[in-house]
Interface confidence: low
């Protein structure tokens, strides 16, 4: 009886034994999986850092060079403003002294039939000078503006004087 | 003796028992570790993942918009550019319009001293017309011109003809 | 679980205004965009506009820009949708969602004259 | 604004058989990033609408693979390979490369 007491003390103590090595080793297993998951979660976090970085400062690259290529545009935009402007004026300007001419060769060419100074007429008859008759006024006009005309092929504005 | 044995089994037991229940206690800690540290690496992934699309998002956004005012600079510097090259063939239809101008006021002029269609001349002495004499020729052109001259105050650009 | 929660039916008077809710749970609005969109009895979608709980940045549609006022409170993990001097047009349901794509249940507002 | 234009109107499909709907827009929807923002949406009749597909072709999470989604540019499908009983409702395409964000005008998937 004793004897029998003693071996099922014995093999309770090798179960309680075995079922410790077993726990030892599941408690081993959980604990080197934590220590591997807290790894692999530092490792996730730091590859996030490194892709939000690097996002960043593709972000900030795409943005940096949109603002260059926007100064580059808004320089040339603003000269060719300003270029323009002074086009502007010019052309301004060449219309009046246009207008001024257009206006002079109008009185040149009515000034044929009238001189503005007249010549003294003398007491008696004299012989007869080279003179100027209204007829033919209009054919020296045709004449002039014939002679000035541009060659073809050139488009002329019309003139706005 | 039998029961001294007895006893100093059932210490063994008892001791590896609680050595069992600790480590019982201690495998379901590292499980519960485990399971919280995979918990909180989900949750820093699924995080980093919100924050890269929120950056994307804001990324693409700035990058969208910078384009829209890239494409509103080309406009105005395309627009200016086309309206700059009318502007300049204006001022150069002016220009030689101008210098036909002038030169046909030139052509007039001198023609104050030489009719360009001679007036046969009669047999006898006949009463003197209204003459034009080469004396009054560089009076009649100053008071043309000047009788041309613009009001005071509008700046006009030097002839280019 | 990602879940939007949106607050109950609306029926106002026209003129009037009126504030709808959207609380997020299972996730912080201050990492997403918060968007509101339209839907009128029997037609389509339309996008109103996002928010940006983090720092107030806000986009909406032109269509809606003057009529409609989103806001957002990050400590009780709210959007917000506001709208004054109501008309019978306005008579929709509203939808909060997400970027990721979650949409809430949406809110009936029903303007009457 | 971009117009997104969906055809057909309505589908109506036998169970088991495919479906295709066809969604255009009035300007490319290729972002500045490379990416296209081109999302599908289903509303089953009394529910809020939820997102199929993402970018043009990414399968939202629990979407069933029978789903799928193409095109570039302006051209986008979303094709069904075998319809099921639960696929009936309005599907909606959208998109979020251009402000204001706009959807198509709906598709209606009938089963017959």
């Known amino acids: 009886k004793v004897e029998e007491l003693a071996r099922s003390l014995r093999m309770d103590i090798e179960r309680v034994a075995r079922e410790n090595s077993d726990l030892q080793r599941q408690k081993l297993e959980a604990q080197q999986g934590l220590q591997a998951s807290q790894e692999a979660k530092q490792k996730v976090e730091k590859e996030a850092q490194a892709r939000e970085a690097k996002l960043q400062a593709e972000c900030s690259r795409q943005t940096q060079l949109a603002l260059e290529e926007k100064a580059v545009l808004r320089k040339e935009r603003d000269n060719l403003a300003k270029e323009l402007e002074e086009k502007k004026r010019e052309a301004e300007q060449l219309r009046m002294e246009l207008a001024i001419r257009n206006s002079a060769l109008d009185t040149c060419i009515k000034a044929k039939s009238q001189p503005i100074i007249p010549v003294p007429r003398p007491m008696g008859p004299v012989p007869n000078p080279q003179t100027i008759d209204p007829a033919s006024l209009e054919e020296f006009k045709r004449k002039i503006l014939e002679s000035q005309r541009p060659p073809a092929g050139i488009p002329v504005a019309p003139s706005s004087g | 003796k039998v029961e001294e044995l007895a006893r100093s089994l059932r210490m063994d037991i008892e001791r590896v028992a609680r050595e069992n229940s600790d480590l019982q206690r201690q495998k379901l800690e590292a499980q519960q570790g485990l399971q919280a540290s995979q918990e909180a690496k989900q949750k820093v992934e699924k995080e980093a993942q919100a924050r890269e699309a929120k950056l994307q998002a804001e990324c693409s956004r700035q990058t969208q918009l910078a384009l829209e005012e890239k494409a509103v600079l080309r406009k105005e510097r395309d627009n200016l550019a086309k309206e700059l090259e009318e502007k300049k063939r204006e001022a150069e239809q002016l220009r030689m319009e101008l210098a036909i101008r002038n030169s046909a006021l030139d052509t007039c002029i001198k023609a104050k001293s030489q009719p360009i269609i001679p007036v046969p001349r009669p047999m006898g002495p006949v009463p003197n017309p209204q003459t034009i004499d080469p004396a009054s020729l560089e009076e009649f052109k100053r008071k043309i011109l000047e009788s041309q001259r613009p009001p005071a105050g509008i700046p006009v650009a030097p002839s280019s003809g | 679980e990602v879940q939007l929660q949106q607050s109950g039916a609306e029926f106002v008077r026209s003129g009037a205004s009126v504030k709808l809710s959207c609380t997020a749970s299972?996730?912080?609005?201050?990492?997403?965009?918060i968007h509101w969109v339209k839907q009128r009895p029997e037609q389509g979608l339309e996008w109103i506009g996002w928010i940006d709980p983090e720092n107030g940045d806000i986009e909406y549609a032109p269509k809606f820009q003057g009529k409609a006022t989103m806001t957002a409170d990050t400590s009780s993990n709210t959007a917000y949708l506001q709208f004054s001097s109501l008309t019978s047009e306005d008579t929709a349901v509203y939808y909060c969602?997400?970027?990721?794509?979650?949409w809430g249940q949406g809110t009936t507002l029903t303007v009457s004259s | 604004d971009v117009v997104m234009t969906q055809t057909p109107l309505t589908l109506s499909v036998t169970i088991g058989q495919p479906a295709s709907i066809s969604c255009k827009s009035s300007q490319s929807l290729l972002n500045s990033d490379g990416k296209t923002y081109l999302n599908w949406l289903l509303q089953r009749p009394g529910q809020s609408p939820k997102r199929l597909i993402y970018l043009v072709s990414k399968l939202d999470s629990g979407v069933p693979d029978r789903f799928t989604g193409s095109g570039s540019g302006t051209d986008f499908t979303l094709k069904i390979s075998r319809v099921e009983a639960e696929d009936l409702g309005v599907y909606y395409c959208?998109?979020?490369?251009?402000?204001?964000?706009?959807f198509g005008g709906g598709t209606k998937l009938e089963i017959k």
């Open positions: 959208w998109q979020g490369t251009h402000f204001p964000f706009t």
């Open positions: 299972g996730f912080n609005i201050k990492d997403y965009y």
């Open positions: 969602l997400y970027q990721e794509g979650s």
